[in-house]
């Protein structure tokens, strides 16, 4: 039975040209995290594997940095980065947990972070 929950940074906004940290946290389970995939709308951004470490997709190497922790840092943001991001936690023995973050990249300097929320 899957008892865990994924807490994410929720809906967030950031300025064009700036950086943002995408962060998920798995709680309420003793399952072992074997791998975390970071995806953007059917596109692989990065993978963090417990044994192999980080792999950043070649097309994002210049703008994506691993961490902090199992999170992901997006740099040099453009308006095209606006959209949904997913953290997929592969765990043993529970299976897969998925968290969702919506990022809006703003032209203006009025960029506020949304509240944290939980996905069961």
């Amino acid at each position: 039975m899957m008892t865990g929950t994924i807490e994410t940074t929720g809906n967030i906004s950031a300025e064009k040209g700036g950086s943002i940290i995408l962060q998920c946290h798995l709680s309420s389970t003793t399952a072992q995290v074997t791998q975390v995939n970071w995806e953007q709308q059917d596109q692989l951004l990065a993978i963090c594997n417990a044994d192999l470490g980080w792999h950043i997709s070649p097309s994002f190497k210049d703008r994506v940095a691993p961490g902090p922790g199992l999170g992901l840092t997006l740099q040099s943001l453009t308006v095209n980065d606006t959209g949904e991001y997913f953290c997929i936690y592969h765990t043993y023995p529970d299976g897969t947990y998925t968290g969702r973050i919506f990022l809006e990249v703003l032209e203006s300097s009025v960029a506020e972070h949304g509240a944290r929320f939980q996905i069961p």
């Epitope: 791998q35 059917d42 596109q43 692989l44 993978i47 594997n49 044994d51 997709s57 097309s59 592969h90």
Partner: antibody
Framework: EVQLLESGGGLVQPGGSLRLSCAAS????????MHWVRQAPGKGLEWVSA????????YYADSVKGRFTISRDNSKNTLYLQMNSLRAEDTAVYYC???????????WGQGTLVTVSS | DIQMTQSPSSLSASVGDRVTITCRAS??????LNWYQQKPGKAPKLLIY???SLQSGVPSRFSGSGSGTDFTLTISSLQPEDFATYYC?????????FGGGTKVEIK
């Protein structure tokens, strides 16, 4: 340099058994899931089996389930495929393959030919 | 099981041509699609992984695109060493499945 070297192929009669081995070098063997993929003469590629880095999880194609057993000895950096109750349709070149992040096959062995015939 | 359908099964092309091979999955596989090149008597070689990522050491004339169910491998300018058979493969779920292959021959 990553190397995967298969051995153990050969001619066997229907109903017989073979054990294939794949000796790995050049990487941290127990960090990677490993797979077997086969290719019948003149045909396409067919996935056969997979095993996690620790050996704790195994997966099989329906066509070999109950007849083939995948295993690994991480102390020897070696992958195995025990093949029992072999059939003519198991005739193929068998490749062992390394699969990082469970997404793609980045290295293949050179293959070993298994021929099942009377 | 997820079925992978490749087209065409074979094609004839000349050096310098732009070549496009398509692969269709029987259900959505997100980006879990890889492309391999195989030459006679040799093991397959990884070209593109995760739909669009170019494997290290592979020439930039190879590119991949698509997500969900429809994927494309493109060779922008065919070179003599590119005449081979190309396979797509899904890693979304087990059993892993391959397309039937596309043989690229010299016109």
């Amino acid at each position: 340099e990553v190397q995967l070297l298969e051995s153990g192929g050969g001619l066997v009669q229907p109903g017989g058994s073979l054990r294939l081995s794949c000796a790995a070098s050049g990487f941290t063997f127990d960090s990677y899931s490993m797979h077997w993929v086969r290719q019948a003469p003149g045909k396409g590629l067919e996935w056969v089996s997979a095993i996690s880095g620790s050996g704790g999880s195994t997966y099989y194609a329906d066509s070999v389930k109950g007849r083939f057993t995948i295993s690994r000895d991480n102390s020897k950096n070696t992958l195995y495929l025990q093949m029992n109750s072999l059939r003519a349709e198991d005739t193929a070149v068998y490749y062992c393959a390394r699969v990082p992040y469970s997404v793609w096959i980045d290295y293949w062995g050179q293959g070993t030919l298994v021929t099942v015939s009377s | 099981d997820i079925q992978m359908t490749q087209s065409p099964s074979s094609l004839s092309a000349s050096v310098g041509d732009r070549v496009t091979i398509t692969c269709r999955a029987s259900q959505s596989i997100s980006y879990y699609l890889n492309w391999y090149q195989q030459k006679p008597g040799k093991a397959p070689k990884l070209l593109i992984y995760a739909a669009s990522s170019l494997q290290s050491g592979v020439p930039s004339r190879f590119s991949g695109s698509g997500s969900g169910t429809d994927f494309t491998l493109t060779i922008s300018s065919l070179q003599p060493e590119d005449f081979a058979t190309y396979y797509c493969q899904q890693s979304y779920s087990t059993p892993l499945t391959f397309g039937g292959g596309t043989k690229v021959e010299i016109k």
